[in-house]
């Protein structure tokens, strides 16, 4: 039975003299008048086994002690602490010449714990003990006993076990303590990663490569390895492992981050609380849920505040301007958090007498700068119908409005637009020319906005360059234009009149005067 | 939920003493424990902590002189060996899962050194 | 480790009175607000009052307000009563370690 000593962590004691309660029982040889057990007091008044020689007077001595088997647990160097006190022999009268100031100290592999004879030959010297401190006749006086402590190492070591033998060449000893240990590197955690007890190597030189293993909730970032060296010191550190997402570094462990916490990645960095308008309900989140009615774009990352749909813009007002409305407005009061704000536009053409009846505006309405993804606050619509209800609604919108689409996010207005002129002529054509006329003819205009009360031909010579024109007025979609020089050419262009007024001008018809009549058809391009 | 301290009393100065906090209500699987002393007429001083895995922390002027340790239903605090500045009120206290800071406590255990 | 700065050592006010007590890290705590106050009256444990430097503990009325981040934190005491004398301690986290404050006295006249 052994009692507990405390020893350096990075030391396994594989025997300690001093632990054992009762009996050593090793074997000395000879069996009587060498090596003998002897119970003593140390410095705490403790009973502790010793072995002592003192056969100084006699010559030739050759006294052996051996311990019991020791097994070698893996170790392939061991350590050997001897604690021992030795006579000087200057003050022993009469012993010149056949008193010894050391011992040697040897040590036998063997699978066999149960060998029962000291065979001197199958022994190893390891080394010759001498003491640094040996004691007087003076010093037995003043009870001073000198306590020298040595130790040997010895390796590399291959079989289950070994014995050690403490030879007595004619020495006044006492074997005091003997402890016989192997160095470990211990059990360790660097850098997240966890690193077993580890034997040193067979060398007082070799370092033992070893691989660490991540602690739990953590991921290798770079291999963590390190290096064990012969004097049991970790040596080294190499790579890393990191805290897996949703847990965070705490004394060398991965602990799950706090509720209220989130980690989205496996980083070196903290947990972080939850963003604004968003929670975690368990401890490990990696990331946060929103609070009700507030959302997270599917771009936003974890750590971004989430964020609600816009509230409706404000102050909108509308300027018609016969079939174009002007529309302005002010950004919403409540952005939601959110700095990807824009504006859509939708517009809905409602019955006259039923405004209920809307339907969508369709595409031949258009709208500068845009319908969609307006950046500013400020749209231009043509190209309606007139004397028709339509109905615009500006919708404010940012990254998470699809997640919560609601009336709210939108104001609206009704206008009613007026009459309209007609739109321009699209083609003009010289149907006949001759020295002195121009028959011309063209097409109704796309978009007419009401009756066409009168079409109005403006021409001119083209030298003159519109300072000196003539106007003929004619309701037909043709006309013969009299009265011109020959060999002359000539700019015409015709609009149409309704009740609302009249539209723009035709791109300009040149045509050039002949001296011969010909038929010849223009369409706005030079006709000779 | 809470928390009892017991084992305070009066010790020699070198003599080893431990306190156990007796927890019901709650699993220490799920919460880590620390311990929190204040000698008398002092303010309060935090000693250590001991994570639900079992691991152990300990403030810097703590190591080596308290060992905290575990069973399923009660945390121990060893004085290793007390001196008398270790004579104060020793509670106990659970850290929270929602912050750091500890939001239940014990009502505390004297220990006198005194030789 | 982190070290807490508790001013003032001692206050004294009238009831319905306010007042506040600062609480100044060494370094930011941890998130730049975990930062705890808490209240003792002699022979009791201490009783948590603001976690995470201004939520309002359980049960506690609202006459007591943490605020600040990072270094600077205060807790505020308006409205005094009789109850409110005690010793109130802040406990900031940073880097595996928990440092209190020196404690105020809080005297209420």
């Known amino acids: 039975v052994t009692g507990s000593r405390v020893y350096p962590a990075n030391e396994v004691t594989l025997l300690d003299s001093r632990s054992v309660q009762g009996e050593l029982g090793w074997i000395a040889s000879p069996l009587e008048g060498g090596w003998e057990e002897v119970s003593i007091m140390d410095e705490k008044n403790t009973p502790i086994r010793t072995y002592q020689v003192c056969n100084v007077m006699e010559p030739s001595q050759n006294n052996w002690l051996r311990t019991d088997w020791i097994t070698r647990e893996g170790a392939q160097r061991v350590y050997i602490e001897i604690k021992f006190t030795l006579r000087d022999c200057n003050s022993l009268p009469g012993v010149m010449g056949t008193c010894k100031e050391t011992f040697n100290l040897y040590y036998y592999e063997s699978d066999n714990d149960k060998e029962r004879f000291i065979r001197e030959n199958q022994f190893v010297k390891i080394d010759t003990i001498a003491a640094d401190e040996s004691f007087t006749q003076v010093d037995i006086g003043d009870r001073i006993m000198k306590l020298n402590t040595e130790i040997r190492d010895v390796g590399p070591l291959s079989k289950k076990g070994f014995y050690l033998a403490f030879q007595d060449v004619g020495a006044c000893i006492a074997l005091v303590s003997v402890r016989v240990f192997y160095k470990k590197c211990p059990l360790t955690v660097r850098n997240l990663a966890q690193f077993p007890d580890t034997i040193t190597g067979a060398d007082t030189s070799s370092l033992v490569e070893v691989r660490g293993s991540c602690v739990n909730n953590s991921e290798e970032k770079d291999v963590p390895k390190m290096y064990c060296g012969a004097d049991g010191e970790w040596l080294v550190p190499i790579g890393n492992c990191l805290c897996n997402a949703g847990h965070e570094e705490r004394s060398g462990e991965c602990q799950a981050c706090k509720i209220g916490y989130y980690k989205a990645l496996s980083t070196d960095a903290t947990c972080a609380k939850c963003p604004p308008h968003s929670y975690s309900v368990w401890e490990g989140a990696t990331s946060c849920t929103c609070d009700r009615g507030f959302f997270r774009a599917d771009n936003d990352a974890a750590s971004m505040p989430c964020t609600r749909p816009p509230s409706a813009p404000l102050n909108l007002i509308s300027n018609v301007n016969e079939t174009s409305v002007n529309l302005e407005w002010s950004s919403p009061q409540n952005t939601g958090g959110r700095q990807d704000i824009s504006y859509n536009v939708v517009c809905k053409k409602c019955g006259a007498g039923d405004p209920s009846k809307c339907r969508p505006c369709g595409s031949g309405v258009h709208y500068t700068p845009q319908q969609n993804g307006l950046k500013t606050t400020k749209v231009s619509i043509t190209d309606l119908l007139a004397h028709t209800n339509y109905t615009f609604e500006i919708w404010a919108v940012n990254g998470v409005s699809k997640y919560n689409p609601s009336p709210d996010q939108s104001v609206s207005v009704t206008v009613t637009t007026n009459q309209a002129a007609p739109s321009s002529i699209a083609l003009v054509q010289a149907k006949e020319v001759t020295r002195y006329s121009v028959a011309l003819a063209w097409l109704e205009p796309d978009r007419p906005n009401g009756v066409i009360l009168e079409y109005e031909v403006k021409y001119y010579e083209k030298d003159q360059n519109e300072r000196s024109y003539r106007i003929v007025r004619t309701a037909a979609r043709n006309t013969d234009i009299k009265g011109l020089n020959p060999l002359t050419s000539y700019v015409f262009h015709v609009r149409a009149r309704t009740a609302a007024g009249y539209g723009d001008f035709s791109e300009p018809l040149e045509v050039t005067t002949n001296t011969v009549p010909s038929r010849i058809i223009g369409d706005g391009a030079n006709s000779t | 939920q809470s928390l009892e301290e017991s084992g305070g009393r009066l010790v020699t100065p070198g003599t080893p003493l431990t306190l156990t906090c007796t927890v019901s209500?709650?699993?220490?699987?799920?919460?880590?424990m620390s311990w929190v002393r204040q000698a008398p007429g002092k303010g309060l001083e935090w000693i250590g902590i001991?994570?639900?895995?079992?691991n152990t922390y300990y403030a810097n002027w703590a190591k080596g002189r308290f060992t905290i340790s575990k069973t399923s239903t009660t945390v121990d605090l060893k004085i290793t060996s007390p001196t008398t500045e270790d004579t104060a009120t020793y509670f106990c206290?659970?850290?929270?899962?929602?912050?750091?800071?500890?939001?239940?406590w014990g009502p505390g255990t004297l220990v006198t050194v005194s030789s | 480790a982190i070290k807490m700065t508790q001013t003032p050592s001692s206050v004294s006010a009238a009831v319905g009175g306010t007042v506040t007590i600062n609480c100044q890290a060494s370094?930011?705590?941890?998130?730049?607000?975990?930062l705890a106050w808490y209240q003792q009256k002699p022979g009791q444990p201490p009783k948590l009052l603001i976690y995470?430097?201004?939520s309002l503990a359980s049960g506690v009325p609202s006459r007591f307000k943490g605020s600040g981040s990072g270094t600077e934190f205060t807790l505020t005491i308006s409205d005094l009563e009789c109850a409110d004398a005690a010793t109130y301690y802040c406990?900031?986290?940073?880097?595996?370690?928990?440092?209190f404050g020196g404690g105020t006295e809080v005297v209420v006249k």
């Open positions: 206290a659970r850290e929270s899962s929602t912050f750091y800071g500890m939001d239940l």
């Open positions: 209500g709650f699993s220490l699987s799920s919460y880590h």
């Open positions: 001991i994570y639900r895995s079992g």
């Open positions: 370094q930011s705590v941890y998130g730049n607000n975990e």
């Open positions: 995470t430097a201004s």
């Open positions: 406990l900031g986290y940073k880097s595996d370690d928990y440092t």
